[in-house]
């Protein structure tokens, strides 16, 4: 019993005054504590408590399930503890089968004794199966078996607490071993979308999937640069063991354009944290913004092909897109598409395929494109180059030589000399009069450029070049002129192509 | 020992709203996860939705998203339960009951409850 | 949603009696099935948890087995507080869910 010097509160006594007792089961435990300031008793074993306010306790048939620590407690609030022992040859252990283990700690089978003096009390595998070989055990009669450092490899493991008795070895209950892993990295997360792109009054839900080796990962969201709590909902699922999934959604019933910005999905274990963004835009409306590919103004060759390319943005996605031209739309020649396949684009193409392009289809060609909140539009102003075409070339009756041509870019005109019969003509004349002429065709048909010398100038046998040419090409007309006499003729005009 | 007490008893009207509340006494339940649980009467258990210290959120049964909304105030130890848009089938004992056995701390079995309130909803 | 299918619905035994309930789930929960007693008018009582481990307090008389999708709760010996309904739930996944019970009436 302890012993305390006189004038302090000493701690209760116990009869009998032995620390551990041994009773048969049936024979009766009778237990006195001795104490002027008695408060209780309290009987304890696995996690079963029981209190009496006698001084003395006494039971009068004893079982097995009596086995345990019995402790008197005074005002003074000192104890003094008994362990008794209710020995049954019918019942060696008492059993609480929970047995959960933290990876890389010491767990408790709770298998203790109702008899101290069994022996070699030990573990043993179920069916007859050997234990792990790293696994390493501490017995103690009172308690249970305390396994060392759990292994995540012991997950599931079947146990049973064993002593022999009497040369044959007995077995508890069997003991499943639940291992709760430790965080050995940080939590995975995933989210549904990196950015997200709504309308004010639509609904934004964005989900997180959370993934570690047990549901004790935290997680939650985040606005950044916020404090303000979220709404969130979650679900969760073991896919076996050591494999957890949690999928936490954060959604705004009725998103509002200050409700833009950056969400942030945060999760944490004892390793660490990991987190992932999405980016949340909220428009007042709709919208549509085009963006041409080529230069709106398109100068083209004759007989060539051209495409007509634009890019565009559009949110809500595009309902309706044509190409015009002259008032006709195009039924074929052109596609449109988005411009991936991702989930969230919202950036389309449209191509316009012109081809072998004549010089009466230039123009004005325009790609229209709406959606539920917005139209647009784009124009291509298409010139077609061609080569000048000389359209009269002729001696007017005032003496006048003159010489009519048409073609894009706006031809030149040039007039050569060329004396008797010489095809080549290098002798230049200057025109007396130069006019472009209104065309009656589109306003992006060709120009139409006339030129006039005056013929009194050539008093010679000869030819006349009327040169018409542009970054296209050239064509060119003669006048032959032959004297008789004091007259002048024209021969026939005739042209002469030069490609 | 750790005991919920839950408040008292409720008579509401079709398309009202009630919040229950469930408060821990004797301890604290800040690291463990709550969930409400209810029945009508003669009827068997129906599971309506958990709040998890471990998750900045709760979950819900798909039957009561959208009107059922739980939340937990740590300072006063208490978690509340508001179902909204009453009808006269949610008539029943609403139970709250703490997670606090077995392997999965988080979603383990119920080893605490509440005493449960009475909700009649009754025009 | 994983069903949880509780047989028998309803059942008489006298005391002493040695009885069986089961419980099936509608896919595997590996054991994160749970057993709860409930008296009239009393909130349900916490009685094995994780197929078979037995609840601090819960007389030894109660035992579970099982695993997967097959579940049995066993009162090896009827006493005359037993007589209550009894219901499975099952932890492994949300939504969490509860069997339709089991009403254990004396004969």
């Known amino acids: 019993q302890p012993s305390v010097s006189p004038g302090e509160p000493s701690p209760p006594s116990i009869h009998p005054g032995k620390s551990d007792l041994i009773v048969r089961v049936g024979d009766e435990i009778r237990l006195l504590c001795t104490d002027p300031g008695f408060v209780k008793w309290t009987f304890e074993i696995l996690d079963e408590t029981n209190e009496n306010k006698q001084n003395e306790w006494i039971t009068e048939k004893a079982e097995a399930t009596n086995t345990g620590k019995y402790t008197c407690t005074n005002k003074h609030g000192l104890s003094n503890s008994i362990y008794v022992f209710v020995r049954d040859p019918a019942k060696l252990f008492l059993v609480d089968r929970s047995l959960y283990g933290k990876e890389d700690n010491d767990t408790l089978v709770r298998c203790p004794l109702t008899d101290p003096e069994v022996t070699n009390y030990s573990l043993k595998g179920c069916q007859g199966k050997p234990l792990p070989k790293d696994l390493r055990f501490i017995p103690d009669p009172k308690a249970g078996i305390m396994i060392k450092s759990v292994k995540r490899a012991y997950h599931r493991l079947c146990l049973h607490c064993s002593v022999d008795q009497e040369g044959k070895s007995v077995l508890s209950e069997k003991f499943i071993l639940k291992v709760r892993p430790a965080f050995k990295a940080v939590p995975v997360v995933s989210v549904s979308k990196a950015s997200y792109l709504l309308r004010e009054g639509e609904e934004f839900t964005v989900t997180c999937t959370i993934k570690d080796v047990s549901s004790s990962v935290y997680s939650t969201w985040k606005r950044e640069n916020s404090q303000t709590k979220l709404q969130e909902k979650y679900n969760s699922w073991h896919h076996g063991d050591f494999n957890y999934e949690r999928q936490a959604t954060l959604t705004i019933s009725s998103a509002r354009v200050n409700d833009s910005g950056v969400f942030m999905c945060y999760a944490n274990n004892t390793f660490g944290s990991a987190n992932v963004t999405t980016t949340l835009e909220v428009v007042d409306k709709g919208f549509i913004n085009i963006f041409p590919m080529i230069n709106t103004t398109v100068f083209v060759n004759d007989g060539e092909n051209v495409d007509l390319i634009v890019e565009y943005e559009a949110f809500p996605k595009p309902e309706h897109q044509q190409w015009i031209y002259m008032n006709r739309t195009f039924t074929d020649k052109w596609e449109d598409y988005p411009k991936s396949e991702n989930e969230s684009n919202i950036r389309y193409v449209s191509e316009l395929h012109l081809t072998r392009l004549k010089g009466t289809e230039g123009g004005t060609y325009t790609f229209l494109v709406s959606n539920s909140d917005v139209n647009a539009a784009i124009a291509f102003n298409v010139y077609v180059n061609t080569k000048p075409e000389i359209l009269t070339y002729d001696r007017l009756v005032n003496g006048m030589l003159q010489c009519v041509a048409a073609g894009f870019p706006e031809p030149t005109i040039d007039w050569y000399f060329c004396p008797g019969t010489e095809q080549r003509c290098s002798a230049s004349v200057l025109p007396v009069d130069v006019q472009t002429l209104n065309s009656s065709g589109p306003p992006f048909g060709k120009l139409v450029v006339q030129s006039s010398i005056d013929s009194s100038a050539f008093k010679h046998n000869g030819t006349v070049e009327c040169k018409a040419y542009n970054d296209v090409g050239k064509t060119s007309a003669y006048f032959n002129f032959a004297f008789k006499g004091n007259n002048k003729e024209q021969i026939h005009p005739h042209t002469l192509f030069t490609p | 020992q750790v005991q919920l007490v839950q408040s008292g008893a409720e008579v509401k009207k079709p398309g009202a709203s009630v919040k229950v509340s469930c408060k821990a006494s004797?301890?604290?339940?800040?690291?463990?996860?709550i969930s409400w649980v209810r029945q009508a009467p003669g009827q068997g258990l129906e599971w309506m939705g958990v709040?998890?210290?471990?998750?900045?959120?709760?979950n819900y049964a798909q039957k009561f998203q959208g009107r059922v909304t739980m939340t937990r105030d740590t300072s006063t130890s208490t978690v509340y339960m508001e179902l909204s848009s009453l009808r006269s089938e949610d008539t029943a004992v609403y139970y709250c009951?703490?997670?606090?056995?077995?392997?999965?701390?988080?979603?383990?079995?119920?080893?605490?409850w509440g005493q449960g309130t009475l909700v009649t909803v009754s025009s | 949603d994983i069903q949880m299918t509780q047989s028998p619905s309803s059942l008489s035994a006298s005391v002493g009696d040695r009885v069986t309930i089961t419980c099936q789930a509608s896919q595997d929960i590996s054991d994160y099935l749970n057993w709860y007693q409930q008296k009239p008018g009393k909130a349900p009582k916490l009685l094995i948890y994780?197929?078979?481990n037995l609840e601090t307090g819960v007389p030894s008389r109660f035992s579970g087995s099982g695993s997967g999708t097959d579940f049995t709760l066993t009162i090896s010996s009827l006493q005359p507080e037993d007589f209550a309904t009894y219901y499975c739930q099952q932890g492994n996944s949300f939504p969490l869910t509860f069997g339709g019970g089991t009403k254990l009436e004396i004969k």
């Open positions: 994780d197929a078979s």
């Open positions: 709040i998890n210290p471990t998750v900045g959120g709760a």
């Open positions: 004797g301890g604290t339940f800040s690291s463990y996860a």
């Open positions: 009951a703490r997670h606090g056995r077995g392997y999965n701390e988080y979603e383990g079995a119920f080893d605490i």
